[in-house]
């Protein structure tokens, strides 16, 4: 499917609006510090060039690859070295090394100001004054803060963002209409970004085979009536889509995602009975809907697996003939029977099966050797079941905030070298597993909880990779993708850690805490809790609870005082002294 001009091909396939949006996302994800106006200028230049290629595919430079065209354009930015330092060295390289270099410089935690939401009237005026610029600014701000955001999905978010303003800026109570919608988009956007970050990490750190295994398991759970060949085709296509998006090839990614949605909808009958509604929607909604579609009903008469994968005399022959196909079939058959298992558990089982076959198929009596392979699965299944049971009980007993605090203490003791903001962010997200998953019936808890935890722990891994401070984090993050959560769960208190020096400034609070939202106030308290554990890693739960209760009472008291600042200064000193005494600091 070779085209004379790749840029013309993608412009025609995607249309001008999507083309411009995707180029803006691509540029903002690469050059995260560039001002909005600079990016818009670059996008307009690329778009004008693309139009000349549509008019005449043989025109000068139209035959160049998208990486060459986009890379050349990014390298025209005048302040590249001042703003990005060594990233400017990428421009001395040739493709494909130049693009790889840009990819390596994507920053998961860019030093950008927090997005502050203006007043509703201000936003509505901006929306009405220049809708196009307003929506481009949204794409730009999200893309630069989330350099791995799934680009075609970001177009879907932008469409919803536009719809929210279109509806709510005409409403009687604009704020009541708009703010909940924006909150929902923000929360969904963060979740979407984190899920995609795991897909990219899977591909980039563990390779295509790891991603394909994940996709086989997940699609087999979702489409249990589909044949193995059908699932395999979907996995191949999905892998291509995500490889492209994670590699910065956003135009190809969006185009291929649209093709995949089209294929799925044209072949619903052999894929899933749950796709009908999705397939009636417009493209962006359709693709999103398919990605989130509920699991189809399992066929009623799936036989046990032992006959084909344990009892058959042909197990080693079938394995030797096509190892990955045979393991893929095992994973497919296991996953379609077990929507109640997490994808990572299914992958651990498949890995154990593979290891057993590797050993046993070289043994004198292979069948005798692998006959009890399913027994090896038992501890692997039990471990997450027990962990989820215990943690859901703890969550139900404590509620979300205190459950987060328990996890903050747990994880700070495991990896105290990690920065406090990262520990707070990650532990708060880990704690959200309770409200997200514990409400589900038991058969849905494990896939909800453990696959969500994989996403959150990947956040820890990518943030830690930027500035590595803990060998234990590096080890858990890099050894095995599917065993990350068990690896972190197994970590005990780090006995090698030298407690942090006590700094009174860390525990000095001011009246500004009183005007913060409940969430921001929680974060302040949780930051103090992490610092407390870093100073006194051997502190007991009871000691920490007593100090935190005193701290909460202190904040409440001073926020009610007439002279808040004086109260914070005087009572704060007393609290620090009392806490030091209570913890033996």
């Amino acid at each position: 499917d070779a085209h004379k001009s790749e840029v013309a091909h993608r412009f025609k396939d995607l249309g001008e609006e999507n083309f411009k949006a995707l180029v803006l996302i691509a540029f903002a994800q690469y050059l995260q510090q560039c001002p909005f106006e600079d990016h818009v200028k670059l996008v307009n230049e690329v778009t004008e060039f693309a139009k000349t290629c549509v008019a005449d595919e043989s025109a000068e430079n139209c035959d160049k690859s998208l990486h060459t065209l986009f890379g050349d354009k990014l390298c025209t930015v005048a302040t590249l070295r001042e703003t990005y330092g060594e990233m400017a060295d990428c421009c001395a390289k040739q493709e494909p090394e130049r693009n790889e270099c840009f990819l390596q410089h994507k920053d998961d935690n860019p030093n950008l100001p927090r997005l502050v939401r203006p007043e509703v009237d201000v936003m509505c005026t901006a929306f009405h004054d220049n809708e196009e610029t307003f929506l481009k600014k949204y794409l730009y701000e999200i893309a630069r803060r989330h350099p791995y955001f799934y680009a075609p999905e970001l177009l879907f978010f932008a469409k919803r963002y536009k719809a929210a303003f279109t509806e709510c800026c005409q409403a009687a109570d604009k704020a009541a209409c708009l703010l909940p919608k924006l909150d929902e988009l923000r929360d969904e956007g963060k979740a979407s970004s984190a899920k995609q970050r795991l897909k990219c990490a899977s591909l980039q750190k563990f390779g295509e085979r790891a991603f394909k295994a994940w996709a086989v398991a997940r699609l087999s759970q979702r489409f249990p009536k589909a044949e193995f060949a059908e699932v395999s085709k979907l996995v191949t296509d999905l892998t291509k889509v995500h490889t492209e998006c994670c590699h910065g090839d956003l135009l190809e990614c969006a185009d291929d995602r649209a093709d995949l949605a089209k294929y799925i909808c044209e072949n619903q009958d052999s894929i899933s009975s749950k796709l009908k509604e999705c397939c009636e929607k417009p493209l962006l909604e359709k693709s999103h809907c398919i990605a989130e579609v509920e699991n189809d009903e399992m066929p009623a008469d799936l036989p046990s697996l032992a006959a084909d994968f344990v009892e058959s005399k042909d197990v080693c022959k079938n394995y030797a003939e096509a190892k990955d196909v045979f393991l893929g079939m095992f994973l497919y058959e296991y996953a379609r029977r077990h929507p109640d298992y997490s994808v990572v558990l299914l992958l651990r089982l498949a890995k154990t099966y593979e290891t057993t076959l590797e050993k046993c198929c070289a043994a004198a009596d292979p069948h005798e050797c692998y006959a009890k392979v399913f027994d090896e699965f038992k501890p692997l299944v039990e471990e997450p079941q027990n962990l989820i049971k215990q943690n859901c009980e703890l969550f139900e007993q404590l509620g979300e905030y205190k459950f987060q605090n328990a996890l903050l203490v747990r994880y700070t003791k495991k990896v105290p070298q990690v920065s406090t903001p990262t520990l707070v962010e990650v532990s708060r997200n880990l704690g959200k597993v309770g409200s997200k998953c514990c409400k589900h019936p038991e058969a849905k808890r494990m896939p909800c909880a453990e696959d969500y935890l994989s996403v959150v722990l990947n956040q820890l891994c990518v943030l830690h990779e930027k500035t590595p401070v803990s060998d234990r984090v590096t080890k858990c993050c890099t050894e095995s993708l599917v065993n990350r959560r068990p690896c972190f769960s197994a970590l005990e208190v780090d006995e090698t850690y030298v407690p942090k020096e006590f700094n009174a400034e860390t525990f000095t609070f001011h009246a500004d805490i009183c005007t913060l939202s409940e969430k921001e106030r929680q974060i302040k308290k949780q930051t103090a809790l992490v610092e407390l554990v870093k100073h006194k890693p051997k502190a007991t739960k009871e000691q920490l609870k007593a100090v935190m209760d005193d701290f909460a009472a202190f904040v409440e008291k001073c926020c009610k005082a007439d002279d808040k600042e004086t109260c914070f200064a005087e009572e704060g000193k007393k609290l620090v002294a009392a806490s030091q005494a209570a913890l033996g600091l």
């Epitope: 077990h338 929507p339 399913f374 058969a443």
Partner: nanobody, 115 residues
Framework: QVQLQESGGGLVQPGGSLRLSCAAS????????MAWYRRAPGKERELVAL???????NYADSVKGRFTISRDYAKNTVYLQMDSLKPEDTAAYYC?????????WGQGTQVTVSS
């Protein structure tokens, strides 16, 4: 080793109700398919109802609208609520559960519908 404990059978008048239960123990693997079969005197064994992990259900035409199968995932237990019972429902009812390793059958519990 998996054990199945069936209970709830008995003698009931036509139009009456019974609730069968079957508790499976001894398997760490969850059963992805749990079912009830029955065998009436002098007849072949037939599937009455089945339920899968995702709570999808299938019923024999003869019991649709009268029998309801359900399961307690955590307790590895399957139930069969039998309402509007008819004399032709008289049979030995067998619990059948399936995991990735194999199928397991219960000993059976007798249901007699008679006035």
């Amino acid at each position: 080793q998996v054990q199945l404990q069936e209970s709830g059978g008995g003698l009931v008048q036509p139009g009456g109700s019974l609730r069968l239960s079957c508790a499976a123990s001894g398997s760490i693997f969850t059963f992805y398919r749990m079912a009830w079969y029955r065998r009436a005197p002098g007849k072949e064994r037939e599937l009455v109802a089945l339920i899968t992990t995702d709570t999808s259900t299938n019923y024999a035409d003869s019991v649709k609208g009268r029998f309801t199968i359900s399961r307690d995932y955590a307790k590895n237990t399957v139930y069969l609520q039998m309402d509007s019972l008819k004399p032709e429902d008289t049979a030995a009812y067998y619990c059948n559960v399936r995991n990735v390793e194999r199928d397991y059958w219960g000993q059976g519990t007798q249901v007699t519908v008679s006035s």
